[in-house]
Every structure is written in C-alpha cells, then in structure tokens.
C-alpha cells in the first residue's frame, strides 16, 4: 500500500490527463482525488499509464467505493479491469449489456480468466436467466462459452436464447449438456418445415431421445455421419436398419469406415446379422 | 446386485494354455445392454484390456494379443470364458473380469485372479 | 490403437488440496471416456463415465471434464480414501486402453 503523504504544491490534479504519466506512485495517490478519477475514468485508457500507477488508481477508487464500484465507473474501466480480482468483481452489480460488452473487449483474444467468468456469473445471475442478446455477446467474445456451463447453469436459458447458438458454440458440449439443450432447441424451431428445422436442430442431435431420431428417419433427412457419430448411444441403439439406412440416406456408407467406434459399433453388435447385410457394406455384428 | 467371480488356476507353464472363467450372478449374461471383458494387470503395472464378448457370440479383441486369445460365452451357465495360448512369464498377470455396460463404462469388476506363469 | 497419456504419473498431496490430473488422447475420442479408482490389492472401481457423468454412489468432489483429446478428472478436496492410484480409459475404439495410471500419495 502507498504510504499517505501530502501532496506537494502545484502538483494537485485537477482533471485526468497525460501529465499523471510522470507523477511518482506516492504522488498519484496523494495529488488524484478519487472521487475525480471516479469521474474521468473514461480518459483512464488513453493514457499510458504504467501497471504500477495503475494499481494506485485502483487503490483509490477501492476507498472511495468499499462497498464495490457503481456501473458508471465500472463501464470505463478498460484496461483497469485487469487489475481486478474475482472478489472484487463479486461486489459488483452489472446489469448493462454495454458494460459487459467493454470488459470483454478488454480481455479480448485471451482465454477466459477467473475474472471474467465472475464478471459473466454475476451479469447473468443479476439478470436470472440467459437471454439471447446476452448469449449473443457472450459467444461472440467466447465460442466455447455455451459448454463451459453445467447441466444446472444451462437450465436457466430459455427457448428463445437458442436462435442466437452457432454450431461451433456446441462443439465442446458434453452428453449432458446437450440432454439440456436439445429440448429447448426443439421448442425454439418447432415451427420450422423439415429440412430448414434439421438444419437448426442438427447441432443439438446429441441429446436426442430415439423417438425424434426415428421420426426424423421418415423425413430424408440425410444426417451426416458426423452427427450421427454425436448421438446418445441409448438413442441409437433400438433404431433397426431399414431406419438407420433412411436418417443417413447416401451417408449409410460412411458406417463402414466407423464400425470400430462408438455409437456404431455398439449399434452393430445388437442388429440380426441378415437385417446388416441388406445394407450391403461388409458390416459384422 | 450383479456380481462377477473369476476362477481357474493360479499356475501355467510356460508354453501352455491359460483357461479361465468368469460366473455372472444376480444377472444375466444375455443382458441387452452389456459386453463382457477380460483385463489384465501385471504386478506393479496399468491395466491392459484383454477382449470382449456380446451374449450373442460377437467377440473383440486387443490387436496385440489377438493371435492368441479366445473368449467364449455359455448362456446356459451365466458364464464367459478366457483361453490365453503360448503362454510365457510377461503374461503373469492379476486377470479381472468386468461387465462393460454401455452407457457407462467397466461398472462391475470380479476380485481378480492372480496367474503366475512359470515352470 | 489409441494411446491415452496420463499426467503427472504420481503426484503428492495433503488432506483438503485440490488434485487435477490430466489424460491426453493421441486422437479425438468425443466424450468417450472414463475414470476407475484403484486401491491395493482392489478391482479398480469407476468414478466417471463420458468424460464428466458421476458414477452411482462416487462422492460429488469428484469431478470430470473435457472431450475430443484434453481430459481432466478433479478432487475438490481430497480425503484420506483417496491415496489410490487414478486410470483414464477410452471406450470410443474397439480396441480399449488405459493410461498409464496417476499415484496419489500422501504428502
């Protein structure tokens, strides 16, 4: 901590400028008001200040706000918002998406540190649930975001937040995540006429109970084998070959070449041998 | 509860062929849902997976013991069977049976069986 | 065949501390994967199965994650049964195989 010293004539500030860059550490915490810097954060980021000054300036600003800061300071924070720790951050309450949107941009191109992942709990706790412009932004800055959450975090995002998942925002999701996901998305494009619909719903396929699969199977689909490689496997396995053949249709020829992984291999061992060889691809069960 | 149980002898000489079975109780070998395995692990080593077996027959072997194993299933006496040939000291071993259930994984395992192969 | 890479091989720890141990997979496995605890003179017992679902019965500080090739079995706070040692294995392929095995050990 910088020690309290009285700060020498002619030096008080009287607004955030460049001149601070020459100001020593003990000068800055005796010559910048606090409730100044409070004021002028947003000329904080146009200054090279060095990471020594900065952690006097948050000093400052952690005495005039023990309680946490209020989000007019907080959305001009910039590059300050490195230098705040988690627990900091749990005093906050950040409820603009504006906000949100700066600090990410602060930590952009990086992967997501403790700090943000707190900045990103507690925006989306104050707000109760996921909504899609939130989700939006949240994928932006973070692809992988979406499968960082748990099974229970995921419960909370609506239907309608759905619209805004990518595909590649659910390439990292694990089986229990997409049992989560895959019924809100079903409700989200449950309007859509079939091919538009297995297009949307085709990235949420792995949490697909054996149903849906069958009746997508009566609809020339066409999955790919790489979909059909991310099913449950308990949906998989009661699905016979004649319904298989249909959901892959021209793709059927791409389970050869898989026979000796999961979920088909699991789904080959449990078919009649005849029923395989209709398929006509060499498969032994 | 389901519960496996490994038997067979605890000595094999070299160049002979180690037999073992592995009873299934308080379940059915038949089960939809399981394969049946054999594991191995050397003493002070990891685990080796040996093989597999489906009720209906369908076996799957690890590609480098291949030339040498046999497992067999006897659905009449809920049991699976192991059938190691050639048999030298690397293959002294704690042999474990285990039910490979499909949605999870190795769930249920016997106390294992200690075969030391030696003249 | 797969190999499955795990690390550290043995690792120290107290009662309380946080143990992460890592398995690598020489190639994508999806979330085929799963995590046995084994004790002396033990059949290994499964703790996670599809890289992150708690087997029945396993306490909750066990914890697993990841998918593809990266995978990570966490102890939230260890407790003396469990100085074991830890075995990933891939189920993906039909030719199954386990890492090398991760000893934990009192400090």
């Known amino acids: 901590e910088v020690e309290k010293t009285a700060c020498p004539s002619g030096k008080k500030a009287r607004e955030i400028d460049e001149s601070l860059i020459f100001y020593k550490k003990w000068e800055l915490e005796a010559c910048v008001d606090a409730a100044l810097l409070a004021t002028q954060m947003d000329r904080v980021n146009a200054i090279p200040f060095t990471y020594e000054q900065l952690d006097v300036l948050k000093h400052k600003l952690d005495e005039l706000y023990p309680q946490g800061y209020p989000e007019s300071v907080i959305q001009h924070l910039g590059y300050l918002f490195l230098k705040m720790s988690p627990e900091d951050i749990r005093k906050w309450n950040v409820t603009s998406l504006e906000t949100l949107k700066a600090l990410l941009e602060v930590n952009k191109g990086h992967e997501m540190s403790p700090q943000v992942a707190t900045l990103i709990d507690r925006f989306v706790k104050g707000r109760g649930q996921l909504d899609k412009d939130t989700l939006d932004t949240l994928t932006a800055f973070y692809p992988g975001y979406l499968c960082s959450l748990s099974p229970e975090e995921l419960s909370s995002v609506p239907p309608s937040s759905i619209w805004a998942v990518r595909p590649q925002d659910l390439d990292t999701c694990d089986p229990r995540q997409l049992d989560v996901l895959y019924p809100k998305a079903r409700l989200a494009f449950q309007n859509m006429n079939g091919s538009e619909y297995f297009v949307k719903i085709q990235s949420f396929l792995g949490g697909a109970p054996t149903e849906d699969l069958k009746a997508l199977s009566q609809q020339n689909v066409s999955m790919d084998l790489a979909t059909f490689m991310k099913l449950r496997t308990d949906a998989v396995l009661p699905l016979t070959v004649a319904e298989v053949q249909k959901l892959l249709g021209p793709h059927v020829e791409g389970l050869k070449a898989e026979e000796r992984h999961r979920p088909v291999r699991d789904w080959i061992l449990r078919q009649r041998q005849d029923d395989l060889d209709t398929l006509g691809l060499g498969l032994q069960g | 509860q389901v519960q496996l149980q490994e038997s067979g002898p605890g000595l094999v000489k070299p160049s002979e062929t180690l037999s073992l079975t592995c009873t299934v109780s308080g379940g059915s070998v038949s089960s939809y849902y399981s394969t049946w395995s054999w594991i191995r692990q050397p003493p002070g080593k990891g685990l080796e997976w040996i093989g597999y077996i489906y009720y209906s027959g369908s076996t799957n072997y690890n590609p480098s013991l291949k030339s040498r194993v046999t497992i067999s299933v006897d659905t009449s006496k809920n049991q699976f069977s192991l059938k190691l040939s050639s048999v030298t000291a690397a293959d002294t071993a704690v042999y474990y049976c285990a039910r490979d259930f499909v949605l999870s994984g190795f769930d249920i395992w016997g106390q294992g069986t200690m075969v030391t192969v030696s003249s | 065949d797969i190999q499955m890479t795990q690390s550290p091989s043995s690792l120290s720890a107290s009662v309380g501390d946080r143990v992460t141990i890592t398995c690598r997979a020489s190639?994508?496995?999806?979330?085929?994967l799963n995590w046995y605890q084994q004790k002396p003179g033990k059949a290994p017992k499964l703790l996670i199965y599809a890289a992150s679902s708690l087997q029945s019965g396993v306490p909750s500080r066990f914890s697993g994650s990841g998918s593809g090739t990266d995978f990570t079995l966490t102890i939230s706070s260890l407790q003396p049964e469990d100085f074991a040692t830890y075995y990933c294995q891939q189920s993906y392929d039909a030719s199954y195989t386990f890492g090398g095995g991760t000893k934990v050990e009192i400090k």
């Open positions: 190639q994508s496995i999806s979330s085929y």
